[in-house]
Interface confidence: medium
């Protein structure tokens, strides 16, 4: 093949070649740079910084080299528009920092910066992490910092990310109120900091006041679908970046809704309750306490993680005609109690015939295993019985 | 036996702070929720603070709410009330009282009570 | 919130008699729990969740009631039992107590 002329040379069926001394100062327009994915770069004395807009459009880029050249910076958001991007190489340069952000989200299998002029700060603590914990190849290439020695024995003590605080109200809130939050950050070489509120959606009515180091949030005319949902607050420094979520609870009344007994590996007599804080619970059958053993149990579901609603079956072990009747549960939290009741009937009653019916007449093993008891009461310093709490 | 002491109580200018302390023993504090009542010149009881089993869950009526902090310290099976911007109508015998066991058992009432001390808030 | 409203203020009657005290609450709650209190003494639990007697109460108190009105019974009373009882509902929130009915020796 002709030797190429040009800046950048094709390399295989997608990758391109820069190696003519001082051809490039930037990276745009690149030919064929959507379907790259591996692009070197040498030699390139006037390309001094990678930025958003230089890569745009290399959504496809696998491996990039720039090696021997200029390269003294490269913003955070750089890699921003190259997601795939596995294996970066930015040895021989002029850089002397890299941010956090600029690896962050990228799944990199080899980061390359040996031969750089590195300062060593708290800006590369999060190199030196690599560094420890054998990532990206870093290891082996025992990283210096220019005239401070090795980057392994920068002292770290004061390197570390924000520390956040976050103060909600401890008193219960109720529909309707206010709820101010304020999110207290610290730290050294605080850059940014927010709110994320994707959960919130109508919840609540969002105002955000102040700034770095005392953020507030005040969440307006609540709901309860407050209840559950995450509030987070963020902050950033050189060092990386710190999250801290919280819920609001936000107190409403117990409620229950019971359906219609279904027969599964057990009957189960299905429920839902809600309210906050968590009902406890208790069954009625006919009117009278029942106490729940091995054969008639309450079973709950799993529970979803951003709603207060619980669902869940009272569960009967082979029911017989002495367990038909009426059902209630009562649930119970401090802002209100609330009952439903349902009819049940498993079974007929064998002894209830009519005298010109034939009597049937079954025949069945005797289990020589069973055993018989009443159920054992627990008894403890309290004058109660025992009921069953959600959440 | 189960006991709670209240202490803390005394005369108060309104608009001035109190902070009344219970001290529990007899029963494993951490277990139970517990609550402060009041009681009236008049007689009259009225409830005034709540706390969960781990302190996390606080309530209280409309009456006291913003002035006053339930709070407890379960290593030193202590319950506290921490009473701000006092009224003349705060004046009463405070007792703090033993809620139900198994967390936040909701159908049981308050079942041991302290003897109480007194808060007189007066100028 | 709920009012409870405890009827008579003030009933009079001799040992042995039984007595019937009357608690009405303004909004239905699902259980009543009653109180004793005697001169100096603090609240001491009766019955709770409306029928249940407490830890160490004699068998001739006993409760009943649903809805908004409930009911404590004291049997046949002994010298003892002359004190003021109070119903408590925290059926809802907030937590309420009634006024009181003063029981005294006629």
């Known amino acids: 093949a002709a030797p190429c002329p040009d800046a950048c040379c094709p390399h295989g069926s997608s990758g391109l070649r820069c190696t003519r001394d001082g051809a490039l100062d930037s990276l745009h327009h690149l030919p064929g740079a959507e379907n790259l994915t591996e692009l070197y770069i040498e030699n390139q004395q006037h390309l001094q910084h990678l930025e958003l807009r230089d890569l745009r459009g290399l959504g496809e880029l696998r491996n990039l080299t720039i090696v021997k050249s200029g390269l003294r910076f490269v913003a955070p958001d750089a890699f921003h528009f190259t997601p795939r991007l596995s294996r970066l190489n930015l040895s021989f340069n002029a850089l002397e920092s890299l941010s956090w952000k600029t690896v962050q989200g990228l799944s990199l299998q080899e980061l390359v910066l040996s031969g750089n002029p590195l300062h060593c700060s708290c800006a590369l603590r999060w190199l030196q992490r690599w560094e420890e914990e054998g990532l990206g190849g870093v290891p082996e290439q025992k990283l210096q910092c220019h005239g401070q020695g090795p980057l392994a024995h920068m002292p770290n003590a004061s390197c570390g990310v924000p520390t956040l605080k976050v103060q909600v109200p401890n008193a219960s809130v109720d529909v309707g109120d206010d709820v101010l939050l304020r999110c207290q950050v610290e730290g050294r070489g605080l850059e940014q900091a927010g709110w994320i509120l994707t959960e919130l959606e109508q919840s609540a009515t969002v105002m955000k006041s102040g700034g770095l180091p005392s953020l507030g949030l005040t969440l307006a005319n609540v709901t309860s679908d407050l209840n559950r949902k995450n509030v987070t607050c963020w902050a950033e420094n050189d060092v990386g970046r710190a999250e801290v979520s919280v819920q609001v609870n936000v107190s409403f009344p117990a409620s229950v809704q019971l359906h219609t007994a279904v027969e599964m590996h057990h009957w189960c007599i299905p429920f839902s309750v809600d309210g906050q804080p968590a009902p406890s619970l208790r069954w009625l059958f006919n009117g009278s306490v029942l106490n729940e053993t091995s054969f008639i149990f309450t079973e709950f579901l799993e529970p979803a993680a951003n709603e207060t609603v619980r669902h869940g079956c009272l569960r009967l072990n082979q029911p017989t005609h002495v367990n038909n009747g009426n059902y209630t549960l009562l649930a119970a939290n401090p802002f209100g109690q609330a009952s439903a009741s349902i009819m049940a009937a498993f079974m007929d009653n064998p002894f209830e015939f009519n005298p010109e019916d034939p009597i049937p007449v079954s025949f069945s093993p005797v289990d020589t295993n069973s055993t018989s008891g009443d159920p054992v009461e627990k008894k403890d310093e309290t004058p109660f019985g025992v009921s069953v709490a959600v959440g | 036996e189960v006991k709670l002491l209240e202490s803390g109580g005394g005369l108060v200018q309104p608009g001035g702070s109190l902070r009344l302390s219970c001290a529990a023993s007899?029963?494993?504090?951490?277990?139970?929720?517990m609550s402060w009542v009041r009681q009236t010149p008049g007689k009259r009881l009225e409830w005034v603070a709540y706390i969960s089993k781990g302190g996390g869950s606080t309530y209280y009526p409309d009456t006291v709410k913003g002035r006053f902090t339930i709070s407890r310290d379960n290593s030193k099976n202590t319950l506290y009330l921490q009473m701000n911007s006092l009224r003349a109508e705060d004046t009463a015998v405070y007792y703090c009282a033993r809620g139900a066991m198994y967390g936040n058992d909701f159908f049981y009432p308050m079942d041991y009570w302290g003897q109480g001390t007194t808060v007189t808030v007066s100028s | 919130e709920i009012v409870l409203t405890q009827s008579p203020a003030t009933l009079s009657l001799s040992p042995g008699e039984r007595a019937t005290l009357s608690c009405s609450a303004s909004s239905s709650v699902s259980y009543m729990h009653w109180y004793q209190q005697k001169p100096g003494q603090a609240p001491r639990l009766l019955i709770y969740t409306t029928s249940n007697l407490a830890s160490g109460i004699p068998a001739r108190f006993s409760g009943s009631g649903s809805g908004t009105d409930f009911t404590l019974t004291i049997s046949s009373l002994e010298p003892e039992d002359f004190a003021v009882y109070y119903c408590h509902q925290w059926s809802s929130y907030p937590w309420t107590f009634g006024q009181g009915t003063k029981l005294e020796i006629k």
């Open positions: 007899g029963f494993t504090f951490s277990t139970y929720t």
